[in-house]
């Protein structure tokens, strides 16, 4: 058993039948000694009496609010949450694996520039009696600050039969070096609880791993004379590190219809403008990417060839 | 060209070929990407390894104050990845496919960092830890680190000439 | 699976116009761009120009701007490549060739061996 | 136009062994070169496309490098099947360009 924060207590179980579960001692928060009762949530029914109770935790029925009493006078609360081993793997019942880049993807982040700021996010299915709490470090033995605020829902989306709720963080280190190699990852922690259910999912990598740029901004045509090709131009986005002589980008301008099976024009550059073919009926679309270091493109930005 | 005595390197020269780094040290092993290796443990292997860090004088103003400290530390780094490059973790069992741009990308770090470093001036380098691992899946493995360390060196080092190309050529 | 056929060989006298015929099948027609690239014997490849079936656009290099003229039949799924005023260094293979995206060249036509000769 | 220059002009390579061919351009290019092989009374063959972009249906021993103004097709052993003449073509601005060619042949 473990404290999460004040008066809240994870007891962590062997999850499995007949399991003989934990024995938990709680203790009365108070200068008493004698008169105290135990209850266990709204009931009134006393578990038992004295400065400690002994109970032996095996499911969830054994979890929740305990509070010891005096004369009808509250004297002290413990919540009780569980964290489940099955198989030796810790349970991860609450949130939805997102399978991206790989199997057992919880939580997903992504960096718009080299600053120190990220963006983490997650999937469930639970609407209600859902809390999370984020903590991150750069490096775990000698850990460096960064500082998350609260995780919000983000979005909503029916799957089929099913609601999501994203919910997303966002993080800030707070001695940011952005022309650094990064040496040390950054860590990221995730405490869920559900009811009376507690997991805690993480995540580590390198800003320069997670790097997705804002789409290119100010897509501009300019056709050329006695030619089907256009001048496309386009400046870097605002959000992007600077100076841009040091962090450059490079890009992917793309002539396509509505469907990605028809045929398109596509042309790769480490300039802001690019000379294509336009068609009737088509977009002109550019993305980037960080010059150097094979992170992930951003979206595109999109204007019609017309 | 960058020496001790604190000239000018070739700017223009330099972000050509570290930028032709870049491109070979993840045609080298494109998939380390997607590779988690934090997972594998060993991370001792390769924290060893030079990294440009936050007082390197490697960031845009540190670059215009004095770039020599900088290019000093490129210099470092390349040298040592050039030699880990060439040692037994690269030669050794499992051979590297014939068609592997690691002999291509050992050449181009010696030759940026002779670039960086004409003959007959010598800044001190960094000494190599011993790393000689027993087993083909630990060289398999370490090979996956160091290259993957490398790809984010040159990202910075190819950061440094482009924004030296740009802004202190003379 | 996609295909090009090209018309046969031509012999052509200096001053003179040829049409090479290139018939794709296997695939929609107008879903793919259709570029003509020759070879001189003995010589490197050499970039003409391409046709968009699906509304006749055209864009020819310089060197074959005003001799050279790509038109479509789709009703035929059928690409022709016309050269006037003919010399004899224009005596080479032409080949058609098709693809999705428009600059590089992924389907080739067998060639068509076109020899200018007085 | 853009002038490409490959080099060697012809290369002499044992079956088994490793060819490694260069095409450059005389300004960036970015990643906009494709290579293709050419047997004798053949037409063009796509091999690689975007620099290193492999085609499904070419060995794998056929892999290309490169960016910005060098760019390396590499055969990593030669088969007698791969002895050809070898063109890389730019697409970076229009007109499209090929290189001079590289002929490989049996040492």
């Known amino acids: 058993i473990w404290e999460l924060k004040k008066d809240v207590y994870v007891v962590e179980l062997d999850w499995y039948p007949d399991a003989p579960g934990e024995m938990v001692v709680l203790t009365c928060d108070t200068p008493e000694e004698d008169g105290i009762t135990w209850t266990l949530d709204q009931s009134s029914e006393v578990l038992g009496s004295g400065k400690t109770l002994t109970i032996q935790v095996k499911e969830f029925g054994d979890a929740g609010q305990y509070t010891c009493h005096k004369g009808g006078e509250v004297l002290s609360h413990s919540l009780l949450l569980l964290h489940k081993k099955e198989d030796g793997i810790w349970s991860t019942d609450i949130l939805k694996d997102q399978k991206e880049p790989k199997n057992k993807t919880f939580l997903r982040c992504e960096a718009k520039n080299y600053s120190g700021r990220f963006t983490c996010w997650w999937l469930t299915t639970i609407s209600t009696d859902l809390t999370f709490s984020v903590k991150s470090s750069r490096g775990s033995s000698d850990p460096q600050g960064v500082t998350c605020g609260a995780a919000t829902l983000s979005a909503e989306r029916v799957r089929g039969d099913n609601k999501e709720y994203e919910y997303s963080v966002e993080c800030q280190e707070d001695s940011a070096c952005p022309a650094a190699e990064e040496s040390l990852p950054i860590e990221v922690m995730v405490d869920a609880v559900h009811k009376l259910k507690y997991e805690n999912y993480t995540s580590s990598f390198f800003i320069r791993d997670i790097i997705k740029p804002d789409p290119p901004k100010n897509l501009q045509l300019k056709p050329l004379k006695n030619s089907r090709q256009v001048e496309v131009s386009w400046e870097y986005p605002d959000t992007w590190s600077t100076p841009h002589s040091y962090f450059s980008l490079t890009f992917c301008v793309q002539v396509q219809g509505k469907s990605k099976r028809e045929k398109k024009d596509r042309v790769f550059t480490d300039k802001t403008s690019a000379t294509v073919i336009c068609r009737k009926n088509a977009s002109i679309s550019v993305r980037a990417q960080d010059r150097y270091y094979s992170s992930s493109w951003s979206e595109w930005a999109s204007v019609p060839c017309s | 060209r960058a020496v001790p005595g604190g000239s000018s390197p070739a700017w223009t020269q330099c972000q050509q070929l570290s930028q032709k780094l870049c491109t070979l040290a993840w045609s080298a092993h494109p998939l380390v990407g997607h590779m988690d290796l934090r997972e594998e443990g060993d991370e001792e292997t390769t924290n060893d390894v030079p990294h440009i860090q936050c007082g390197d004088g490697c960031d845009p103003q540190g670059l215009r104050d004095n770039s020599q400290f900088c290019l000093q530390r490129i210099h470092q780094g390349l040298i040592f990845y050039e030699k880990l490059l060439g040692s037994d973790i690269f030669t050794g069992e499992p051979s590297l496919l014939p068609d592997s741009p690691v002999g291509q990308l050992h050449a181009s770090l010696l030759g940026l960092s002779q670039l960086l470093q004409p003959e007959g001036h010598h800044w001190e380098t960094q000494q190599i830890p011993s790393l000689s691992p027993s087993q083909p899946w630990q060289r398999l493995l370490l090979r996956f680190k160091i290259l993957r360390s490398l790809q984010a060196f040159v990202a910075v080092a190819a950061r440094v000439f482009a924004h030296g190309a740009a802004t202190l050529s003379p | 699976q996609v295909q090009l056929v090209q018309s046969g060989a031509e012999v052509k006298k200096p001053g003179a116009s040829v049409k090479v015929s290139c018939k794709a099948s296997?695939?929609?027609?107008?879903?793919?761009?259709l570029h003509w690239v020759r070879q001189a014997p003995g010589q490197g490849l050499e970039w003409m120009g391409w046709i968009d079936p699906e509304n006749g656009d055209t864009e020819y290099a310089p060197k074959f701007q005003g001799r050279v003229t790509m038109t479509t039949d789709t009703s035929t799924s059928t690409a022709y490549m016309e050269l006037r005023s003919l010399r004899s260094d224009d005596t080479a293979v032409y080949y058609c060739?098709?693809?999705?995206?428009?600059?590089?060249?992924?389907?080739w036509g067998q060639g068509t061996m076109v020899t200018v000769s007085s | 136009e853009i002038v490409m220059t490959q080099s060697p002009a012809t290369l002499s390579v044992s079956p088994g062994e490793r060819a490694t061919l260069s095409c450059r351009a005389p300004?960036?290019?970015?990643?906009?070169l494709h290579w293709y092989q050419q047997k004798p009374g053949q037409a063009p063959r796509l091999l690689i496309y975007f620099a290193s972009q492999s085609i499904s249906g070419i060995p794998a021993r056929f892999s290309g490098s490169g960016s910005g103004t060098e760019f390396t097709l590499t055969i990593s052993s030669l088969q007698s099947e791969d002895f050809a003449v070898y063109y890389c073509?730019?697409?970076?601005?229009?007109?499209?360009?090929f290189g001079g060619g590289t002929k490989v042949e049996i040492k």
């Open positions: 300004q960036s290019i970015s990643i906009n």
């Open positions: 060739n098709a693809n999705k995206e428009l600059r590089y060249f992924d389907v």
């Open positions: 296997g695939y929609t027609f107008t879903d793919y761009y």
């Open positions: 073509q730019q697409s970076n601005s229009f007109p499209l360009t």
